[in-house]
């Protein structure tokens, strides 16, 4: 009866995400059969969350909204385990917003999710960012710097990176 | 007042490539990014790509890539448009715009004429 | 790549009748589309953004409504200086396409 009521919690907790992520791949999180985290297919996982590599090339709003309706935002870096981990899907030959920006132009910058900006975990190439009309943040590769952060105009299109919490059932 | 302002009519032959200039005035050049449409004779509108001028940071269409060079002058406020191997498909009115704040095409130039002929 | 499917590619009308022009995208776009007015010789003008939202000193007889793939571009009321030919062009990812045209004309 507990392993029925809780099948049919998981059921209706999948239901939710169908419209956006038709299919999910699950793993048992520690020994218990109990817990499962998801990504949807075929977004990959790290820690507690799921990313999503977005190659259609939109601007730093757009790209924003189309994180957003699939449940997710652009991506907020924490750390640089986090950051190793995400460039491994990346092309060194393009460019990926972040959810980062400076909508005022005044070098406030701030995260999506509005998670405190923290210079200390910041990851400029150096000399940025340099310009107050370029308002949003992408990550990029530099043959001297291999992968870092540069600020540019929002509104030239860009491929990026959506970020989500796991899907927990 | 906002202007764009692009330079005179072309005729080129088959093969060869033109560069169409367009000179922006009434606003701060290095703000708003900078798009390229073309007009085939009597045909609707196709959008060929874009450039910011701050940075020379491009973005084209897929279509044109390979043949279609967009760069900037900041000292003249200027942005240019370079399509190369030129071929009687390219016959056109080219037409470059601004992006405004809203991110739509908010002023455009008066367009140039390219004529491919042999 | 989305596509823009605009319709009708032409029309005939009167003075002061209402004109309603489609425009549909092979996929979801979001809102994030404009209207153009072009008349011959002449750069297209921009008269509506994210669907509905008139562009400065455009007359309020120009409206735009829709959602999704489809969208409506809509004359209340035809003035002589409204035969011209009306674009659609969608800007939610590049590139940034344009619908085929719909040429308004005198009846």
């Known amino acids: 009866n507990f392993m029925y009521s809780k099948t049919v919690k998981r059921l209706s907790k999948l239901r939710e995400y169908q419209q956006y992520h038709p299919s999910l791949t699950c793993v048992m999180e520690g020994k218990d059969i109990e817990d499962w985290s998801c990504c949807p297919t075929p977004w990959t996982s790290f820690q507690s969350s799921c990313y999503f590599i977005s190659t259609g090339m939109q601007s730093w709003t757009k790209s924003q909204k189309n994180c957003s309706v699939m449940g997710a935002d652009l991506v907020v870096i924490n750390t640089r385990e986090e950051q190793d981990f995400i460039i491994q899907n990346l092309k060194r030959n393009s460019s990926y917003f972040l959810g980062l920006s400076d909508p005022g132009g005044r070098r406030h910058w701030q995260w999506v999710d509005q998670t405190p900006y923290n210079e200390n975990v910041t990851f400029w190439h150096s000399g940025e960012p340099n310009n107050l009309d370029e308002r949003c943040a992408i990550i990029n590769f530099r043959s001297s710097e291999e992968w870092g952060w540069n600020d540019i105009h929002c509104h030239v299109p860009q491929k990026s990176i959506c970020k989500m919490k796991k899907i927990y059932i | 007042q906002v202007q764009l302002v692009q330079s005179g009519a072309e005729v080129k032959k088959p093969g060869a490539s033109v560069k169409v200039s367009c000179k922006a005035s009434?606003?701060?050049?290095?703000?708003?990014?900078i798009h390229w449409v073309r007009q085939a004779p009597g045909q609707g509108l196709e959008w060929m790509g874009t450039i910011y001028p701050g940075s020379g940071d491009t973005s084209y269409n897929q279509k044109f890539k390979g043949r279609v060079t967009m760069t900037r002058d900041t000292s003249t406020s200027t942005v240019y448009m370079e399509l190369s191997s030129l071929r009687s498909e390219d016959t056109a009115v080219y037409y470059c715009a601004r992006m405004g704040d809203n991110e739509y095409f908010d002023y455009w130039g008066q367009g140039t004429l390219v004529t491919v002929s042999s | 790549d989305i596509q823009m499917t605009q319709s009708p590619s032409s029309l005939s009308a009167s003075v002061g009748d209402r004109v309603t022009i489609t425009c549909r995208a092979s996929g979801n776009i979001h809102n994030y589309l404009a209207w153009y007015q072009q008349k011959p010789g002449k750069a297209p003008k921009l008269l509506l953004y994210?669907?509905?939202t008139l562009a400065d000193g455009v007359p309020s007889r120009f409206s735009g409504s829709g959602s999704g793939t489809d969208y409506t571009l809509t004359i209340s009321s035809l003035q002589p200086e409204d035969f011209a030919t009306y674009y659609c062009q969608h800007f939610w990812s590049t590139p940034y396409t344009f619908g085929g045209g719909t040429k308004v004309e005198i009846k």
């Open positions: 009434g606003y701060t050049f290095t703000s708003y990014i």
């Open positions: 994210d669907a509905e």
